[in-house]
Protein backbone atom coordinates (compact mmCIF):
# COMPACT_ATOMS: atom_id res chain seq x y z
CA UNK A 1 0.00 0.00 0.00
CA UNK A 2 2.80 2.39 1.27
CA UNK A 3 4.66 1.38 -2.31
CA UNK A 4 1.45 2.47 -4.18
CA UNK A 5 1.06 5.77 -2.80
CA UNK A 6 4.85 6.73 -2.84
CA UNK A 7 4.83 5.37 -6.64
CA UNK A 8 1.39 7.76 -6.88
CA UNK A 9 2.73 10.60 -4.95
CA UNK A 10 5.86 10.36 -7.24
CA UNK A 11 3.79 10.50 -10.17
CA UNK A 12 1.22 13.71 -9.44
CA UNK A 13 4.37 15.57 -8.14
CA UNK A 14 6.54 14.72 -11.53
CA UNK A 15 3.69 15.69 -13.65
CA UNK A 16 3.18 19.37 -11.71
CA UNK A 17 6.86 19.58 -11.88
CA UNK A 18 7.19 18.99 -15.50
CA UNK A 19 3.56 21.10 -16.48
CA UNK A 20 5.23 23.67 -14.53
CA UNK A 21 8.46 23.52 -16.93
CA UNK A 22 6.66 23.50 -19.97
CA UNK A 23 5.15 26.62 -18.06
CA UNK A 24 8.61 28.89 -17.26
CA UNK A 25 9.60 28.15 -21.09
CA UNK A 26 7.03 29.45 -22.56
CA UNK A 27 6.47 32.55 -20.80
CA UNK A 28 8.05 35.87 -21.63
CA UNK A 29 9.00 36.52 -18.42
CA UNK A 30 12.61 35.45 -18.05
CA UNK A 31 14.36 39.34 -17.44
CA UNK A 32 12.42 42.31 -16.98
CA UNK A 33 14.26 45.26 -16.78
CA UNK A 34 11.91 48.65 -14.88
CA UNK A 35 13.02 51.77 -17.40
CA UNK A 36 11.74 53.81 -14.74
CA UNK A 37 13.86 56.88 -15.75
CA UNK A 38 12.76 56.77 -18.95
CA UNK A 39 12.12 60.44 -20.39
CA UNK A 40 9.54 59.78 -22.64
CA UNK A 41 7.28 57.67 -20.74
CA UNK A 42 7.92 54.92 -18.08
CA UNK A 43 8.75 51.55 -20.06
CA UNK A 44 8.72 47.77 -18.51
CA UNK A 45 10.86 45.95 -20.98
CA UNK A 46 10.55 42.25 -20.33
CA UNK A 47 12.20 38.69 -22.13
CA UNK A 48 11.34 35.52 -22.83
CA UNK A 49 13.43 32.34 -24.31
CA UNK A 50 11.18 33.30 -27.03
CA UNK A 51 10.62 36.53 -27.97
CA UNK A 52 11.04 40.31 -26.09
CA UNK A 53 7.84 42.33 -25.40
CA UNK A 54 7.60 45.77 -24.02
CA UNK A 55 5.11 47.21 -21.76
CA UNK A 56 4.46 51.36 -21.44
CA UNK A 57 2.56 53.14 -18.91
CA UNK A 58 -0.11 54.12 -21.57
CA UNK A 59 -0.93 50.43 -21.77
CA UNK A 60 0.70 49.64 -24.77
CA UNK A 61 1.86 46.33 -24.80
CA UNK A 62 4.23 45.20 -27.78
CA UNK A 63 5.72 41.28 -28.06
CA UNK A 64 8.66 40.23 -30.97
CA UNK A 65 9.78 37.06 -31.71
CA UNK A 66 13.51 36.22 -31.71
CA UNK A 67 13.21 35.02 -35.47
CA UNK A 68 17.23 34.46 -35.85
CA UNK A 69 19.24 31.87 -34.04
CA UNK A 70 22.58 33.57 -35.30
CA UNK A 71 22.09 36.46 -33.34
CA UNK A 72 21.11 35.21 -29.97
CA UNK A 73 23.73 34.59 -27.26
CA UNK A 74 25.19 31.39 -26.38
CA UNK A 75 24.09 31.14 -23.66
CA UNK A 76 20.25 32.10 -24.48
CA UNK A 77 20.39 29.17 -27.04
CA UNK A 78 22.06 26.60 -23.98
CA UNK A 79 18.93 27.32 -21.83
CA UNK A 80 16.36 26.79 -24.73
CA UNK A 81 18.32 23.36 -25.21
CA UNK A 82 18.30 22.66 -21.68
CA UNK A 83 14.59 23.26 -21.01
CA UNK A 84 13.50 21.32 -24.22
CA UNK A 85 15.82 18.30 -23.51
CA UNK A 86 13.96 18.57 -19.63
CA UNK A 87 10.56 18.52 -21.43
CA UNK A 88 10.33 16.16 -24.03
CA UNK A 89 12.68 14.04 -20.91
CA UNK A 90 9.30 14.51 -18.13
CA UNK A 91 7.00 13.85 -21.10
CA UNK A 92 8.79 10.42 -21.71
CA UNK A 93 8.88 9.80 -18.35
CA UNK A 94 4.81 10.76 -17.14
CA UNK A 95 4.25 8.37 -20.46
CA UNK A 96 6.63 5.08 -18.75
CA UNK A 97 5.65 5.99 -15.58
CA UNK A 98 1.72 5.61 -16.41
CA UNK A 99 1.94 2.34 -17.53
CA UNK A 100 4.54 1.60 -14.44
CA UNK A 101 1.85 2.54 -12.04
CA UNK A 102 0.62 -0.67 -9.67
CA UNK A 103 -3.06 0.61 -9.84
CA UNK A 104 -3.11 0.24 -13.49
CA UNK A 105 -3.07 -2.97 -14.71
CA UNK A 106 -2.21 -3.54 -18.53
CA UNK A 107 -2.58 -7.42 -19.37
CA UNK A 108 -0.05 -10.06 -17.33
CA UNK A 109 2.25 -6.97 -16.92
CA UNK A 110 4.93 -8.38 -14.01
CA UNK A 111 5.95 -6.91 -10.86
CA UNK A 112 9.58 -7.11 -12.50
CA UNK A 113 8.22 -5.03 -15.44
CA UNK A 114 6.75 -2.31 -13.67
CA UNK A 115 9.32 -2.01 -10.93
CA UNK A 116 12.28 -1.79 -13.75
CA UNK A 117 9.47 1.19 -15.63
CA UNK A 118 8.97 2.62 -12.63
CA UNK A 119 12.81 3.09 -12.00
CA UNK A 120 13.03 4.12 -15.24
CA UNK A 121 10.61 7.14 -15.48
CA UNK A 122 12.09 7.85 -12.36
CA UNK A 123 15.47 8.59 -13.62
CA UNK A 124 14.46 10.13 -16.00
CA UNK A 125 12.30 12.84 -13.96
CA UNK A 126 15.47 13.28 -12.13
CA UNK A 127 17.41 13.94 -15.05
CA UNK A 128 14.08 16.32 -16.26
CA UNK A 129 14.31 17.64 -13.44
CA UNK A 130 18.05 19.04 -13.21
CA UNK A 131 17.86 20.29 -16.98
CA UNK A 132 15.21 22.59 -15.53
CA UNK A 133 17.50 23.58 -12.64
CA UNK A 134 20.00 23.99 -14.77
CA UNK A 135 18.58 26.27 -17.67
CA UNK A 136 16.93 28.25 -15.09
CA UNK A 137 20.35 29.20 -13.33
CA UNK A 138 22.31 29.14 -16.31
CA UNK A 139 19.88 32.22 -17.18
CA UNK A 140 19.62 33.87 -13.93
CA UNK A 141 24.04 33.81 -14.15
CA UNK A 142 23.74 35.66 -17.55
CA UNK A 143 21.53 37.85 -16.26
CA UNK A 144 24.19 38.75 -13.13
CA UNK A 145 26.33 38.70 -15.43
CA UNK A 146 25.24 41.22 -17.99
CA UNK A 147 24.14 43.78 -15.07
CA UNK A 148 27.77 44.01 -14.13
CA UNK A 149 29.03 44.22 -17.76
CA UNK A 150 26.10 46.98 -18.53
CA UNK A 151 27.24 49.54 -16.00
CA UNK A 152 30.21 51.53 -17.43
CA UNK A 153 30.08 50.04 -20.99
CA UNK A 154 30.00 52.99 -23.51
CA UNK A 155 31.42 53.01 -26.92
CA UNK A 156 31.35 55.48 -30.13
CA UNK A 157 29.81 54.03 -32.99
CA UNK A 158 29.74 55.07 -36.47
CA UNK A 159 26.29 57.35 -36.40
CA UNK A 160 27.49 58.90 -33.10
CA UNK A 161 27.45 57.32 -29.85
CA UNK A 162 26.45 53.86 -28.47
CA UNK A 163 25.52 53.12 -24.62
CA UNK A 164 23.69 50.21 -22.26
CA UNK A 165 21.58 52.13 -20.60
CA UNK A 166 21.64 51.93 -17.22
CA UNK A 167 18.39 49.36 -16.25
CA UNK A 168 17.65 46.96 -13.13
CA UNK A 169 17.74 43.81 -14.50
CA UNK A 170 15.21 41.67 -12.26
CA UNK A 171 14.63 38.14 -12.37
CA UNK A 172 11.57 37.20 -13.71
CA UNK A 173 8.21 35.15 -12.62
CA UNK A 174 9.59 32.29 -15.22
CA UNK A 175 13.00 31.71 -13.16
CA UNK A 176 11.17 31.04 -9.77
CA UNK A 177 8.30 29.31 -11.41
CA UNK A 178 11.32 27.25 -13.09
CA UNK A 179 13.12 26.56 -10.24
CA UNK A 180 10.20 25.22 -8.46
CA UNK A 181 8.72 23.26 -11.11
CA UNK A 182 12.58 21.28 -11.78
CA UNK A 183 12.88 20.58 -7.89
CA UNK A 184 8.88 19.00 -7.57
CA UNK A 185 9.97 16.84 -10.89
CA UNK A 186 13.26 15.94 -8.83
CA UNK A 187 11.32 15.28 -6.00
CA UNK A 188 8.76 13.23 -8.17
CA UNK A 189 11.48 11.39 -9.59
CA UNK A 190 13.47 10.55 -6.65
CA UNK A 191 9.79 9.33 -4.69
CA UNK A 192 9.45 7.34 -8.22
CA UNK A 193 13.06 5.24 -7.79
CA UNK A 194 11.33 4.77 -3.93
CA UNK A 195 8.92 3.01 -4.76
CA UNK A 196 11.03 0.99 -7.41
CA UNK A 197 12.58 -0.76 -4.54
CA UNK A 198 9.30 -1.50 -3.10
CA UNK A 199 7.66 -3.02 -6.32
CA UNK A 200 10.57 -5.11 -6.93
CA UNK A 201 10.04 -8.59 -5.82
CA UNK A 202 12.49 -10.25 -3.82
CA UNK A 203 14.12 -13.44 -5.52
CA UNK A 204 12.23 -16.23 -3.66
CA UNK A 205 13.43 -19.82 -3.55
CA UNK A 206 10.01 -21.84 -3.17
CA UNK A 207 10.88 -25.08 -3.73
CA UNK A 208 8.24 -27.89 -2.77
CA UNK A 209 9.72 -30.99 -0.75
CA UNK A 210 7.90 -33.83 -0.78
CA UNK A 211 8.05 -36.20 2.27
CA UNK A 212 7.43 -39.70 1.08
CA UNK A 213 6.01 -41.62 4.19
CA UNK A 214 7.21 -45.60 4.55
CA UNK A 215 3.88 -46.79 5.36
CA UNK A 216 0.77 -45.57 3.01
CA UNK A 217 0.36 -42.07 3.88
CA UNK A 218 -0.37 -39.57 1.64
CA UNK A 219 2.70 -37.22 0.61
CA UNK A 220 2.06 -33.61 1.65
CA UNK A 221 3.93 -30.36 1.65
CA UNK A 222 4.06 -28.13 4.74
CA UNK A 223 2.64 -24.81 4.19
CA UNK A 224 5.31 -22.74 5.10
CA UNK A 225 8.22 -22.74 2.90
CA UNK A 226 11.41 -20.55 3.44
CA UNK A 227 12.45 -17.59 1.43
CA UNK A 228 15.86 -16.83 0.79
CA UNK A 229 16.21 -14.30 3.56
CA UNK A 230 19.65 -15.70 4.52
CA UNK A 231 17.52 -16.85 7.85
CA UNK A 232 16.96 -20.43 9.05
CA UNK A 233 18.64 -23.53 8.33
CA UNK A 234 17.14 -24.68 5.09
CA UNK A 235 18.77 -21.98 2.45
CA UNK A 236 20.30 -24.60 0.56
CA UNK A 237 17.46 -26.44 -0.22
CA UNK A 238 19.41 -29.43 0.97
CA UNK A 239 17.99 -33.16 2.38
CA UNK A 240 15.86 -32.28 5.25
CA UNK A 241 16.26 -36.17 6.20
CA UNK A 242 17.31 -39.39 4.46
CA UNK A 243 13.64 -40.74 5.28
CA UNK A 244 12.65 -40.36 1.99
CA UNK A 245 12.49 -36.87 1.63
CA UNK A 246 13.72 -34.78 -1.01
CA UNK A 247 13.84 -31.53 -2.55
CA UNK A 248 11.67 -31.19 -5.86
CA UNK A 249 14.76 -31.00 -7.86
CA UNK A 250 15.88 -34.66 -6.73
CA UNK A 251 12.33 -36.19 -6.94
CA UNK A 252 12.35 -39.27 -9.71
CA UNK A 253 11.07 -38.80 -12.62
CA UNK A 254 8.87 -42.39 -12.64
CA UNK A 255 5.68 -41.94 -10.74
CA UNK A 256 4.87 -43.37 -7.15
CA UNK A 257 1.44 -43.88 -6.29
CA UNK A 258 1.75 -42.17 -2.96
CA UNK A 259 3.15 -38.96 -5.02
CA UNK A 260 0.06 -36.05 -5.30
CA UNK A 261 2.36 -33.21 -5.70
CA UNK B 1 25.40 47.39 -34.66
CA UNK B 2 22.15 49.87 -34.50
CA UNK B 3 22.44 53.51 -36.10
CA UNK B 4 21.08 56.97 -35.97
CA UNK B 5 21.70 59.51 -38.50
CA UNK B 6 19.78 63.13 -38.33
CA UNK B 7 18.91 64.98 -41.00
CA UNK B 8 16.98 68.23 -42.25
CA UNK B 9 18.82 70.86 -40.45
CA UNK B 10 20.02 73.88 -42.14
CA UNK B 11 19.53 78.11 -41.83
CA UNK B 12 16.36 78.96 -41.36
CA UNK B 13 14.54 82.66 -40.49
CA UNK B 14 12.60 83.32 -37.34
CA UNK B 15 8.56 82.31 -37.88
CA UNK B 16 9.91 80.17 -40.34
CA UNK B 17 9.47 75.73 -40.60
CA UNK B 18 12.46 73.12 -40.90
CA UNK B 19 11.60 68.89 -40.31
CA UNK B 20 13.97 66.73 -39.16
CA UNK B 21 14.18 63.35 -39.74
CA UNK B 22 16.06 60.38 -37.77
CA UNK B 23 16.82 56.95 -39.36
CA UNK B 24 17.79 54.28 -37.51
CA UNK B 25 19.46 51.61 -39.29
CA UNK B 26 21.71 48.45 -38.76
CA UNK B 27 20.76 45.14 -36.61
CA UNK B 28 17.85 46.43 -35.14
CA UNK B 29 15.50 43.91 -33.20
CA UNK B 30 13.24 46.80 -31.58
CA UNK B 31 13.49 50.60 -31.15
CA UNK B 32 11.26 51.30 -27.84
CA UNK B 33 11.68 55.27 -27.34
CA UNK B 34 12.82 57.91 -29.47
CA UNK B 35 13.78 61.35 -28.76
CA UNK B 36 14.87 64.48 -29.83
CA UNK B 37 17.42 66.52 -27.80
CA UNK B 38 18.99 70.06 -28.20
CA UNK B 39 22.35 71.41 -27.20
CA UNK B 40 23.02 75.37 -27.88
CA UNK B 41 26.76 76.81 -27.33
CA UNK B 42 27.92 76.53 -23.81
CA UNK B 43 24.28 75.17 -22.49
CA UNK B 44 23.51 71.67 -21.29
CA UNK B 45 21.94 69.17 -23.57
CA UNK B 46 18.07 68.97 -23.27
CA UNK B 47 15.23 66.67 -24.31
CA UNK B 48 13.21 68.99 -26.82
CA UNK B 49 10.58 65.97 -27.38
CA UNK B 50 10.14 62.13 -27.36
CA UNK B 51 8.08 59.53 -28.87
CA UNK B 52 7.41 56.02 -27.34
CA UNK B 53 6.77 52.82 -29.69
CA UNK B 54 3.03 52.96 -28.52
CA UNK B 55 2.70 56.60 -29.88
CA UNK B 56 3.20 58.18 -26.20
CA UNK B 57 4.71 61.62 -26.72
CA UNK B 58 6.64 64.25 -24.51
CA UNK B 59 7.33 67.45 -25.33
CA UNK B 60 9.68 70.56 -23.52
CA UNK B 61 7.65 73.35 -21.80
CA UNK B 62 9.45 75.91 -24.30
CA UNK B 63 8.21 74.18 -27.64
CA UNK B 64 5.23 72.90 -26.81
CA UNK B 65 2.27 73.86 -29.64
CA UNK B 66 5.26 74.80 -32.10
CA UNK B 67 6.92 71.50 -32.48
CA UNK B 68 5.42 68.12 -33.53
CA UNK B 69 7.18 64.64 -33.10
CA UNK B 70 5.86 61.78 -35.06
CA UNK B 71 7.15 58.47 -35.92
CA UNK B 72 7.26 55.41 -38.33
CA UNK B 73 7.72 52.04 -36.47
CA UNK B 74 7.94 50.08 -39.71
CA UNK B 75 10.84 51.94 -40.81
CA UNK B 76 12.48 52.82 -37.54
CA UNK B 77 11.98 56.54 -38.73
CA UNK B 78 11.11 59.44 -36.09
CA UNK B 79 10.18 62.90 -37.37
CA UNK B 80 10.35 66.86 -35.94
CA UNK B 81 8.37 69.04 -37.65
CA UNK B 82 9.22 72.35 -36.24
CA UNK B 83 7.01 75.49 -37.09
CA UNK B 84 7.22 79.45 -35.59
CA UNK B 85 10.82 78.75 -35.02
CA UNK B 86 12.95 81.81 -32.51
CA UNK B 87 16.43 82.42 -32.27
CA UNK B 88 16.51 80.43 -29.48
CA UNK B 89 15.74 76.94 -31.19
CA UNK B 90 19.55 77.30 -32.67
CA UNK B 91 21.43 74.40 -31.73
CA UNK B 92 22.09 70.96 -32.52
CA UNK B 93 19.81 68.70 -32.26
CA UNK B 94 20.44 65.11 -31.66
CA UNK B 95 18.42 61.76 -31.97
CA UNK B 96 18.60 59.43 -29.66
CA UNK B 97 17.16 55.72 -29.56
CA UNK B 98 16.56 53.50 -27.10
CA UNK B 99 16.21 49.79 -28.32
CA UNK B 100 16.64 46.36 -27.08
CA UNK B 101 19.31 44.12 -28.83
CA UNK B 102 18.84 40.42 -28.48
CA UNK B 103 22.64 39.74 -29.85
CA UNK B 104 23.83 40.97 -26.02
CA UNK B 105 20.23 40.83 -24.28
CA UNK B 106 21.13 44.32 -23.27
CA UNK B 107 19.15 47.59 -23.42
CA UNK B 108 20.51 50.24 -25.52
CA UNK B 109 20.95 53.36 -26.10
CA UNK B 110 22.26 54.93 -29.56
CA UNK B 111 23.15 58.49 -30.17
CA UNK B 112 23.00 60.07 -33.51
CA UNK B 113 26.35 62.98 -34.16
CA UNK B 114 24.14 65.65 -34.63
CA UNK B 115 22.70 68.27 -37.05
CA UNK B 116 22.45 71.97 -36.57
CA UNK B 117 19.61 74.00 -37.40
CA UNK B 118 20.45 77.94 -37.25
CA UNK B 119 17.02 80.53 -36.41
CA UNK B 120 18.84 83.53 -37.99
CA UNK B 121 17.34 86.94 -39.84
Known amino acids: MAVTACQGLGFVVSLIGIAGIIAATCMDQWSTQDLYNNPVTAVFNYQGLWRSCVRESSGFTECRGYFTLLGLPAMLQAVRALMIVGIVLGAIGLLVSIFALKCIRIGSMEDSAKANMTLTSGIMFIVSGLCAIAGVSVFANMLVTNFWMSTANMYTGMGGMVQTVQTRYTFGAALFVGWVAGGLTLIGGVMMCIACRGLAPEETNYKAVSYHASGHSVAYKPGGFKASTGFGSNTKNKKIYDGGARTEDEVQSYPSKHDYV | EVQVQESGGGLVQPGGSLRLSCAAS????????MGWYRQAPGKQRELVAG???????TYAHSVKERFTISRDNAKNTMYLQMNSLKSEDTAGYYCNAQAWDPGTFRYLEVWGQGTLVTVSA
Open chain 2, 51 to 57: ISRGGTT
Open chain 2, 26 to 33: GNIFRIDT
